[in-house]
Interface confidence: low
């Protein structure tokens, strides 16, 4: 094995709680480890996990490449939360999941030139700044190095939501400054999304993996996948989708590497479903397509979509108002 840019003390060193270091102007020593953390220089990893930390440790070692700050008590991530002197230039993967983060400020991840993977999952984000990932409020920001952005279950409880669209807040952060043009994986599962703003995917052209599972998406009618020529997996399981229309089907079929996951949606098997059933029978892009079943109408419940034919898919005639019953 080759030598590494830092020396190879391979065991995790754990710093004792009583060694909490004060913030000083001195840069941290390469071999020091923040209080309540475990550090391995050989693996370039620092883990400060389930330690009730209220803020990001000041004295992170400069070699850190993988930083785990999960399961702590942080509520706000301020601008420059990871700005250090010298900078944490090697930090590549940052996991902040399972904290109590309510606010991520503009520029929270500035001065991390190598940050490729960021996980903010399981934080009740009531205020995600539009410039959390872009770093500045310019119309076109410096490109973010992020390749993976994991934002599963970041929706706050209903009573804590601001008077604005949660979807809109998240999308604003994804699109600000066109900084995330290089993003390849985006996970937005379990966020109660009712809709997907139509412009979001067009501005993330490098996406390979998009996870929108376990949301409340009812329709994809206004969502365009046309630009996502690199998309390899699209997770739409456990939503509220009723049918996919022709335009969407054609766009998905046109993506060269795509695999689509559609399990556990309440498919409505009426006359509007005919095109989708025809497409399902012919396509290879849908994984587990034999598992897709009807939820409505009642007479069709649990029927397998692939086994339906046009005669099964009828719509009740619309009665004139004078004949409708209440």
């Amino acid at each position: 094995s080759s030598s590494s840019p830092t020396s190879s003390a391979s065991s995790f060193s754990s710093s004792a709680p009583f060694l909490a270091s004060a913030v000083s102007a001195q840069p941290p020593l390469p071999d020091q480890c923040p209080a309540l953390c475990e550090c391995s220089e050989a693996a370039r990893t620092v883990k400060c996990v389930n330690r009730n930390l209220l803020e990001v440790p000041a004295d992170l070692p400069p070699y850190v490449r993988n930083l785990f700050l999960t399961g702590n008590q942080m509520t706000v991530l301020p601008a420059g939360a990871f700005a250090r002197q010298p900078p944490l230039a090697d930090l590549e993967a940052l996991n902040l999941s399972g904290n109590h983060l309510k606010e991520v400020c503009a520029g929270a991840f500035e001065h991390l030139p190598g940050l490729r993977r960021l996980d903010l999952s399981h934080n009740p984000l009531t205020n995600l700044s539009a410039f959390a990932f872009a770093g500045s409020n310019a119309s076109v920001s410096a490109p973010s190095p992020l390749v993976e952005l994991i934002l599963n279950h970041i929706v706050p409880p209903e009573d804590e939501r601001q008077n604005r669209s949660f979807e809109g807040m998240v999308v604003a952060a994804l699109l600000a400054g066109r900084a995330l043009q290089g993003l390849r994986r985006l996970e937005l599962a379990s966020n109660h999304f009712l809709y997907l703003p139509r412009d979001v995917l067009a501005q993330l052209p490098s996406l390979r993996h998009l996870d929108l599972s376990n949301n409340s998406l009812v329709s994809l009618t206004y969502v365009s996948f046309r630009n996502l020529t690199h998309l390899e997996s699209l997770h739409l399981e456990d939503n509220a989708l009723k049918v996919l229309h022709n335009g969407t089907l054609a766009e998905l079929q046109g993506l060269p590497h795509i695999r689509v996951f559609l399990d556990n949606n309440p498919w409505v098997c009426d006359c509007h479903m005919a095109d989708m059933v025809t497409w399902l029978k012919e396509t290879e892009v849908v994984q587990g397509k034999d598992r897709l079943t009807c939820a409505y109408p009642e007479k069709m419940r649990n029927r397998v979509l692939l086994e339906l034919n046009s005669a099964d898919l009828d719509c009740d005639p619309i009665l004139p108002p004078s004949l409708q019953t209440s």
């Epitope: 094995s1 080759s2 030598s3 590494s4 840019p5 391979s10 391995s40 050989a42 693996a43 990893t45 490449r65 993988n66 230039a89 090697d90 590549e92 993967a93 030139p113 190598g114 490729r116 993977r117 190095p145 993976e148 994991i150 390849r184 994986r185 993996h209």
Partner: antibody, heavy 117, light 108 residues
Framework: QVQLQQSRPELVKPGASVKMSCKAS????????ISWVKQRTGQGLEWIGE????????YYNEKFKGRATLTADKSSSTAYMQLSSLTSEDSAVYFC??????????WGQGTTLTVSS | QIVLTQSPAIMSASLGERVTLTCTAS???????LHWYQQKPGSSPKLWIY???NLASGVPARFSGSGSGTSYSLTISSMEAEDAATYYC?????????FGAGTKLELK
């Protein structure tokens, strides 16, 4: 210390498939990217793809997409690469390497693949 | 993709001589993500210089690296016998990741 131990040399026939392994030790397997790199005799280095076992993210060089399949087994801290539809052009040494933006710090010793009838 | 062109392909140097190897990228590369590896016959490559100018641990101080944009170089201030090897530049800036074809440095 960090080590990447690769599987033994392979001699296979054209058209066949091969699966080679890279067992990691000395660090937390799910925390780091493993890349695979090809080197033909007397030639340079060619990146095949990378796998991030933590999230099972996989990125391929388009040139190898469809013929190379990268997987990882977290329980044994082992990364695998399968190559299919082999031809003589695939005869090479294949390295696994750990690292990312800031270089591949650790390399396996290489697995020599010979494709011959 | 970003093509890295190394020159010269083969170079001979005498003991004590100053040696410069160059690596030119077909489009601009962030200097944080431009690295050099040393490889000797029968061995795996070793990370030698990372992020343009940082020496990997154990690399002698006679080595240095510099550059930005599309032009990068590795310099040995005073050639020693153990420096004879092939050196590859490598970019981790854009997918697919690419390597230069290598410069084989021989002892004259």
């Amino acid at each position: 210390q960090v080590q990447l131990q690769q599987s033994r040399p392979e001699l296979v026939k054209p058209g066949a498939s091969v699966k080679m392994s890279c067992k990691a030790s000395g660090y937390t397997f799910t925390d780091y990217v493993i890349s695979w790199v090809k080197q033909r005799t007397g030639q340079g280095l060619e990146w095949i793809g990378e796998i991030y076992p933590g999230s099972n993210s996989i990125y391929y060089n388009e040139k190898f997409k469809g013929r190379a399949t990268l997987t990882a087994d977290k329980s044994s801290s082992t990364a695998y690469m399968q190559l299919s539809s082999l031809t003589s052009e695939d005869s090479a040494v294949y390295f696994c390497a750990m690292g990312g933006n800031y270089g591949f710090d650790y390399w396996g010793q290489g697995t020599t693949l010979t494709v011959s009838s | 993709q970003i093509v890295l062109t190394q020159s010269p392909a083969i170079m001979s140097a005498s003991l004590g001589e100053r040696v410069t190897l160059t690596c030119t990228a077909s489009s601009s590369v962030n200097s944080n993500y431009l690295h050099w590896y040393q490889q000797k016959p029968g061995s795996s490559p070793k990370l030698w210089i990372y992020s343009t100018s940082n020496l990997a641990s154990g690399v002698p101080a006679r080595f240095s690296g510099s550059g930005s944009g599309t032009s990068y170089s590795l310099t040995i201030s005073s050639m020693e016998a153990e420096d004879a090897a092939t050196y590859y530049c490598h970019q981790y800036h854009r997918s697919p990741l690419t390597f230069g074809a290598g410069t084989k440095l021989e002892l004259k």
